[in-house]
Interface confidence: low
């Protein structure tokens, strides 16, 4: 099909455009170009007869058009009026006509824009500023840049007038920036020079430095004042309300007690007409006073509160020192000193942080010490412990249980048996116990200051016969070569002997096996997969003996280095590749394959039917044991030869 392509479609004024003809039919008599979407003799630009190779201008010919033998039309020195449609009329040798229409659009080359502003010195939080991008150009798009970034989203920024005007409402000092505008049309884009917005602001409340307010007699007083302001602020100093001088710094040498008082700095901005003041009270000491410690929290709660200890008074050019437990401060991430060493902060206090704490002020001759301060750290109660630890008693003996929980203030204790309150004492005594005294014995410890309570429950069994023991373990799934396992034979009983068996045999002698706690606890250090055996404990006294059920240790191990089978590495084209991967592991590992580094499936067997030389490469089996967190892998190179090219190749699976 005859088509016209405009190259380019969007043309800049003064440039040229080529109306390129595609799929021109064979056996042509000639062709003619027309301005517009139809054949109109009054709008003919140029005609061309192939036989004579003669081009004839038409009424719409401007002298800027060139027609080529392939029917394409070049228009030079494009003007705005050239925008629109162009129709090619082709006359074939059989005098059958064909037409095609193309078009292009003409745009002006944009001039460099500039920015005009309605307010060159806006005042912060008061004025608005409107920037306008000049000149106004038809069919142009306007863009804005702030510090060479596109406009941020802000309710104070508003575009109007077809984006030609950018308004900043309620300007702030942060609007002080470089602003540019850009004009764009399909053929050009131009940016303006920067306009820097100069926002008048301030003065803010001045700050007086240094911050310290205590000085010694004979020192120099040197105060400096600063307030954020544009233009920069003018400063005045007043002492006890009396004007001193119009400078940013106030200097008084060799001060005395009489220089104590209120010092005021006033900052003034002549453009905004605003004033702001700040007052500091200066105290001049005749001689260094005895220091003392103030605390922001006299009863801090353990693991919750921080405590800031401050050495008073604040004196300029003084060295502050601290001691804890009559020692210099230990290095600890929980101890922080302020820049001037005057404040010691204990982050997240513990019961061990009680002190005593002392601070000192160093002068030329000696160090003045404060009185010691002790922190009253509230803590606990911790989980109470019930002693003795026996859980098994014979009838007729006395039961005497004691409860203790670390706590400040000291805990209040209550005893419950099978959930029923018995007494509010630290000790529980029952004489001449019987089987009826078996039950759940609960000690409850309460801290009245923190309101916290903690309980511990102990099972007491009163019986003439020893119970069937059981084995508790501190680690049900230990990892090989990493973990230790402690088996404990329950219950703990008075006057009882504890025995152990492994796979029905008495304990082997091994440096990795250790008995403790009156043989009640058996510890296996650095377990191996060979420790996955049946463990039994036994208890006996003069009346009876009993054995636990066996506990089998489930040792997690692996994955070991995997093995890929079959071992063949050479295959014939067309064979099936069936690789199986195996790794010793507990639990069974997850398998995955990669071919030439590319992940395949998560299966133990990799099967590829009818392999070709394209299947050459490295086949890696990856094994991972999520329980041990360990991984392993092996790589095998597979070579596939075209059938019959190499003798002795495996036919595959």
């Amino acid at each position: 099909k005859l088509t016209i392509e405009s190259t380019p479609f969007n043309v800049a004024e003064g440039k040229e455009v080529l109306l390129l003809v595609h799929n021109l039919p064979q056996h042509l008599f000639g062709y003619s170009w027309y301005k517009g979407e139809r054949v109109d003799g009054n709008r003919q630009i140029i005609g061309y007869v192939i036989g004579t190779q003669q081009a004839t201008p038409g009424p719409a010919y401007s002298g800027r058009e060139i027609i080529y033998p392939n029917a394409s039309l070049l228009i030079q020195n494009i003007i705005q009026n050239d925008t629109g449609f162009y129709t090619l009329h082709v006359i074939k040798s059989d005098l059958v006509n064909e037409e095609a229409t193309g078009q292009f659009r003409v745009y002006p080359e944009l001039p460099k824009p500039s920015i005009s502003s309605n307010n060159s010195k806006p005042v912060e939080d008061k004025d608005a500023v409107a920037f306008t991008c000049e000149p106004e150009t038809q069919d142009a798009t306007y863009l804005w840049w702030v510090n060479n970034q596109s406009l941020p989203v802000s309710p104070r920024l508003q575009l109007s007038n077809g984006n030609r005007t950018l308004t900043l409402f309620n300007v702030t000092r942060n609007d002080t920036a470089s602003y540019k505008c850009e004009t764009q049309n399909p053929v050009s884009a131009r940016r303006s020079d920067s306009v820097i917005l100069n926002v008048l602001y301030g003065p803010d409340a001045p700050t007086i430095s240094p911050l310290n307010t205590s000085y010694r007699s004979g020192e120099n007083l040197n105060l400096s004042c600063h307030a954020a302001s544009n233009p920069p602020a003018q400063y005045s100093w007043f002492v006890n309300g009396t004007f001193q001088q119009s400078t940013q710094e106030l200097f008084i040498p060799n001060i005395t007690v009489n220089n104590s008082g209120s010092y005021t700095c006033q900052a003034h901005n002549s453009d905004t007409g605003l004033n702001r003041t700040t007052v500091t009270t200066i105290t001049v000491y005749a001689e260094p006073p005895k220091p003392f410690i103030t605390s922001n929290n006299s009863n801090p709660v353990e693991d919750e509160d921080a405590v800031a200890l401050t050495c008073e008074p604040e004196i300029q050019n003084t060295t502050y020192l601290w001691w804890v437990n009559n020692q210099s401060l230990p290095v600890s991430p929980r101890l922080q000193l302020s820049n001037d060493n005057r404040t010691l902060t204990l982050l997240s206090v513990t019961r061990n942080d009680v002190g005593p704490y002392e601070c000192g002020i160093q002068n030329e001759l000696s160090v003045d010490h404060s009185d010691p301060v002790i922190l009253n750290v509230l803590y606990g109660p911790d989980d109470p412990t019930i002693s003795p630890s026996y859980t098994y008693y014979r009838p007729g003996v006395n039961l005497s249980l004691s409860c203790h929980a670390a706590s400040n203030p000291p805990a209040q204790y209550s005893w419950l048996i099978d959930g029923n309150i018995q007494q509010h004492t630290q000790e529980l005594f029952i004489s001449n116990i019987t089987e009826k005294n078996s039950g759940l014995y609960t000690c409850q410890a309460n801290n009245s200051a923190s309101g916290h309570s903690r309980t511990t429950v102990k099972t007491i069994t009163v019986s003439a016969e020893l119970p069937k023991p059981s084995i508790s373990s501190n680690n049900s799934k230990p990892v090989e070569d990493k973990d230790a396992v402690a088996f404990t034979c329950e219950p703990e009983a008075q006057n009882t002997t504890y025995l152990w068996w492994v796979n029905g045999q008495s304990l082997p002698v091994s440096p990795r096996l250790q008995l403790s706690n009156g043989n009640r606890t058996l510890t296996l250090f650095n377990v191996t997969r060979n420790d996955a055996r049946a463990y039994v404990c036994g208890i006996q006294n003069s009346v009876s003996a009993n054995r636990s059920d066996p506990v089998t240790l489930d040792v997690l191990y692996g994955p070991d280095t995997p093995i890929i089978s079959p071992p063949d590495s050479s295959y014939l084209s067309g064979a099936n590749l069936n690789l199986s991967c195996h790794s010793a592991s507990n639990p069974s590992p997850q398998y995955s394959w990669r071919i030439n580094g590319i992940p395949q499936q998560h299966t133990q067997v990799l099967f590829i039917a009818k392999i070709t030389p394209n299947n050459n490469g490295t086949y890696a089996c990856f094994v991972s044991n999520l329980a041990t967190g360990r991984n392993n892998s092996i790589v095998k190179s597979i070579t596939v030869s075209a059938s019959g090219t190499s003798p002795g190749l495996s036919a595959g699976a």
Partner: antibody, heavy 124, light 110 residues
Framework: QVQLQESGPGLVRPSQTLSLTCTAS????????MHWVRQPPGRGLEWIGW????????EYAPKFQGRVTMLVDTSKNQFSLRLSSVTAADTAVYYC?????????????????WGQGSLVTVSS | DIQMTQSPSSLSASVGDRVTITCRAS??????????MHWYQQTPGKAPKLLIY???NLQSGVPSRFSGSGSGTDYTFTISSLQPEDIATYYC????????FGQGTKLQIT
């Protein structure tokens, strides 16, 4: 077994950002490209994009380019989808999925493991 | 983007009927000896389920009455003997470039 599970808020306000997380179990996401697909109510399936958890590389459908971000947390075996400046047209069931966990042939994206889907409604 | 045109958009058939759905890609989705066309089944309220991958491969666990064929731009999905549980919407999907799905075919039983 191999599973994917989407989670996130069911209601998002217009112009806000839609955030969903997909948690994988039974396999390691670092071995696979992980995808998001959505389905507006009563309409067909639309592929949104993929992330390679091994290196964080992403590729998004042109339709979502500029609004979509996909992130990964391999320590939790999770990946996530963030779609900004949402409108009512973003109301859909969002699925996370992955390709070819159970198939023998390696190829580009087809999806045989899908989450159950998470309906997200965009409304004020 | 490669556009997918799936037809018909809906169809009704009886139990035991042979059902065919076609999918045409705007350009070839075959390369390197593979045809990157896949077929899914989606029942209401559920996630799509892969039935056929790479034009003709039956996904593990999918009944053998489902099959697929085709290469280049034209692909066909067939259910040889329609069962009541096959009521669903079926989608084709290519993966030659960034994935796109067909608009779906809703299958009902008369």
């Amino acid at each position: 077994q191999v599973q994917l599970q989407e989670s996130g808020p069911g209601l998002v306000r217009p112009s806000q950002t839609l955030s969903l997380t997909c948690t994988a179990s039974g396999f390691n996401i670092k071995d696979y490209y992980m995808h998001w697909v959505r389905q507006p109510p009563g309409r067909g399936l639309e592929w949104i994009g993929w992330i390679d958890p091994e290196n964080g590389d992403t590729e998004y459908a042109p339709k979502f380019q500029g609004r979509v971000t996909m992130l990964v947390d391999t320590s939790k075996n999770q990946f996530s989808l963030r779609l900004s400046s949402v409108t009512a047209a973003d109301t859909a069931v969002y699925y996370c999925n992955t390709r070819g966990l159970s198939t023998m042939i390696t190829t580009r994206w087809f999806f045989d493991v899908w989450g159950q889907g998470s309906l997200v409604t965009v409304s004020s | 983007d490669i556009q997918m045109t799936q037809s018909p958009s809906s169809l009704s058939a009886s139990v035991g009927d042979r059902v065919t759905i076609t999918c045409r890609a705007s350009k070839s989705v075959s390369a390197s000896g593979y045809s990157y066309m896949h077929w899914y089944q989606q029942t209401p309220g559920k996630a799509p389920k892969l039935l056929i991958y790479l034009a003709s491969n039956l996904q593990s666990g999918v009944p053998s009455r489902f099959s697929g064929s085709g290469s280049g731009t034209d692909y066909t999905f067939t259910i040889s003997s329609l069962q009541p549980e096959d009521i669903a919407t079926y989608y084709c999907q290519h993966s030659r470039e960034l994935p796109t799905f067909g608009q779906g075919t809703k299958l009902q039983i008369t």
